[in-house]
């Protein structure tokens, strides 16, 4: 049956026994910052390709053994989450890859930068459709990645990040406080926030909206056919990817602001319970989490 | 040809452009006022001193990046400092990246053209 | 354009092995896995595996495992199919296809089992 | 024994419509989204028709349409021609492998 995800975000004429949008996504590229992925894995294979770009720092510990599997785990399962086509939210994008975060999930700043410079010059190299841009990670407050991320929202290009897992502010850390960014925090089953060990969400006015971010299912790099759950706001964020790319799919004209805008419209509202958030921040957080756009526009996203 | 050589004749560049700046009114200098100023990561642990995003301000041309971190080689060398250019950045926001010792940032913020350095950190997976 | 160019057609008697290859072209071959599948004469399809183009990582059908074993040389885009303790009945046309999804196939290669 | 049971042939006269059907169960053809179909004439290597239920790769007829219904998914072919006379065989993932059909035969009169 239909995961519990893919259920929350699709309107209630889509909720068969399947989700099955037969052409999501399919004029949109989405860019993934993170780990290197496993892109043939059957979920994915021919979806994704990865790019030559890679910047990441060595990896922390002198006993630290690289192991495929382990690298590829983080970004793999996200690209599921955008484009997998069991599993996946916008089963029609194809993706591009690049690498900016190391075997334990670490990057850098200033890599980040490098990267997003690349889908830059990638961009007026070789102008394509609509461009989403995921971004999955998380670091303090950063002046020059907020900056960087305005210019490139500037240049046309939707980036959607993670709120970040340490529930906490999402306006100290970066690139989730940048404004142009989509900042989006992670919901469960229940449509509780979502607590990850003694930590969970960031919440507060940086964040945009919610998505489902806890016990999601997807392509798994411990083998190529394998699935796992998992959990975080880099999930919710990849959602969210996956919505606009199926938005920007069926309007390629939309603007960052047009598009927001009916981001925010098509969420389900108030279903969050905001008790879990601390109270000065519960004024300050939007209660929506994300949903596709209702039957009314049938002939635009499920083409 | 002179323009395009590098750590050697970095003091001979600074001499001349100073000397043109003064000759033909070229503020090489940051402008009155405009004080450069320098960040970095609240966070202590996710802190990576030795390495800065030297950020431009935003008309710099891709020449004058690059010619801006030649400077700050040549004035860091002169210093006794080894620094090393990782990356200049154009395209999206002028600047550049470097490997040099905290010791150089007063310096650094010094530079023509500097809007803004900040210390690099460190980004998770979540 | 995307191509898989398989080797040529073989006899082999019973207990012995064979090598096919199957070299790929024409695409980003790290996106996706080759499979392998056969067709004895007159009869249906027989997925045999599939290998990873990217890490190497094979997934074997139960019917072959233990005696199937697929390579790939990333240097020359080139994968192999080696089936060992070879029986009558896997006379067949072997074929390799792109990934999972099997969306180019390669031209078939013959393989006659007999004493 | 195949995985997925089709019929082992079907006919029509040109210009009319036919359907293949490929039953398996929710381990395969009902649990994936991802059923193909395979047309393979004589001496050829298969060649993919129909992907992920009812997608056509470029160059493929649109006369050429795939859907499903729960365990069993369906080719249909409309406008016959005589060229669409070959073997037809659906194929669908499973939790670790892939399985075709047993083949279609299809005449055209």
């Known amino acids: 049956s239909i995961p519990w995800n893919l259920e929350r975000i699709t309107p209630p004429r889509y909720r068969a026994d399947e989700y099955q949008p037969p052409d999501g996504g399919s004029l949109v590229e989405v860019y993934l910052l993170d780990t290197s992925i496993q892109s043939d894995h059957r979920e994915i294979e021919g979806r994704v390709m990865v790019t030559d770009f890679e910047n990441v720092p060595e990896e922390d510990g002198t006993r630290f053994h690289r192991q495929a599997s382990k690298c590829d785990s983080h970004g793999t399962h996200l690209a599921g989450v955008v484009s997998g086509r069991d599993a996946g939210v916008a089963k029609g994008a194809s993706m591009r890859s690049l690498r900016v975060l190391n075997c334990q999930g670490k990057g850098t700043v200033s890599g980040t930068l490098i990267g997003l410079e690349f889908i830059r010059k990638s961009q007026l190299v070789q102008p394509v459709g609509p461009l989403v841009v995921l971004l999955p990670l998380a670091g303090g407050y950063s002046r020059v990645l907020n900056a960087a991320c305005q210019r490139l929202a500037r240049a046309g290009v939707v980036l959607v990040t993670a709120a970040g897992n340490f529930r906490d502010d999402a306006c100290l850390y970066s690139p989730a406080s940048a404004p142009e960014v989509i900042t989006v925090g992670a919901t469960n089953a229940q449509d509780q926030p979502v607590t990850l060990g003694t930590l969970g969400t960031n919440f507060g006015r940086c964040v945009d909206l919610f998505a489902p971010g806890e016990d999601i299912i997807g392509a798994s790099s411990d083998c190529s056919t394998c699935f796992v759950s998992q959990s975080g706001t880099s999930q919710a964020a990849a959602h969210v990817a996956g919505i606009a790319a199926m938005m920007l799919s069926a309007e390629p004209e939309l603007t960052l602001a047009e598009l927001r805008q009916r981001l925010i419209h098509f969420s389900a509202k108030d279903v969050i319970n905001e008790a879990w958030f601390p109270e000065d921040q519960r004024v300050l957080t939007p209660n929506l989490v994300a949903a596709l756009p209702p039957s009314t526009h049938e002939n635009l996203y499920f083409q | 040809g002179a323009m395009g050589q590098e750590d050697e004749d970095g003091d001979y560049e600074e001499l001349v452009l100073a000397l043109r700046s003064e000759e033909d009114g070229l503020a090489e200098a940051p402008e009155h006022g405009t004080t450069a100023t320098f960040h970095r990561c609240a966070k202590d642990p996710w802190r990576l001193p030795g390495t800065y995003v030297v950020v431009l301000k935003e008309e710099t041309h891709l020449s004058q990046s690059e010619r801006t971190a030649r400077r700050l080689q040549a004035q860091a060398a002169r210093r006794g400092y080894l620094t090393k250019i990782l990356h200049v950045f154009h395209g999206l926001l002028p600047g550049f990246l470097v490997k040099m010792s905290g010791d150089l940032l007063e310096l650094a913020l010094k530079l023509p053209h500097v809007d803004y350095i900040e210390e690099d950190s460190s980004v998770f997976a979540q | 354009q995307v191509q898989l160019v398989q080797s040529g057609a073989e006899v082999k008697k019973p207990g012995a092995s064979v090598k096919v290859s199957c070299k790929a072209s024409g695409y980003p071959l790290t996106s996706y896995g080759i499979s392998w599948v056969r067709q004895a004469p007159g009869q249906g399809l027989e997925w045999m595996g599939w290998?990873?183009?990217?890490?190497?990582?094979?997934n074997y059908a139960q019917k072959v495992q233990g005696r199937v074993t697929m390579t790939t040389d990333t240097s020359t885009s080139t994968v192999y199919m080696e089936l060992r303790s070879l029986r009558s009945d896997d006379t067949a046309v072997y074929y390799c296809a792109r990934g999972y999804g099997m969306d180019v196939w390669g031209q078939g290669t013959t393989v006659t089992v007999s004493s | 024994q195949s995985a997925l049971t089709q019929p082992a042939s079907v006919s029509g006269s040109p210009g009319q419509s036919i359907t293949i059907s490929c039953t398996g169960t929710s381990s395969d053809v009902g649990g994936y989204n991802s059923v193909s179909w395979y047309q393979q004439h004589p001496g050829k290597p298969p060649k993919l028709m129909i992907y992920?239920?009812?997608n056509r790769p470029s160059g493929v007829s649109n006369r050429f349409s795939g859907s499903k219904s729960g365990n069993t998914a369906s080719l249909t072919i409309s406008g016959l021609q005589a060229e669409d006379e070959a073997d037809y065989f659906c194929s669908s993932y499973t939790s670790t492998s892939m399985v075709f059909g047993g083949g279609t035969k299809l005449t055209v009169l």
């Open positions: 290998i990873s183009a990217y890490n190497g990582n094979t």
């Open positions: 992920e239920v009812s």
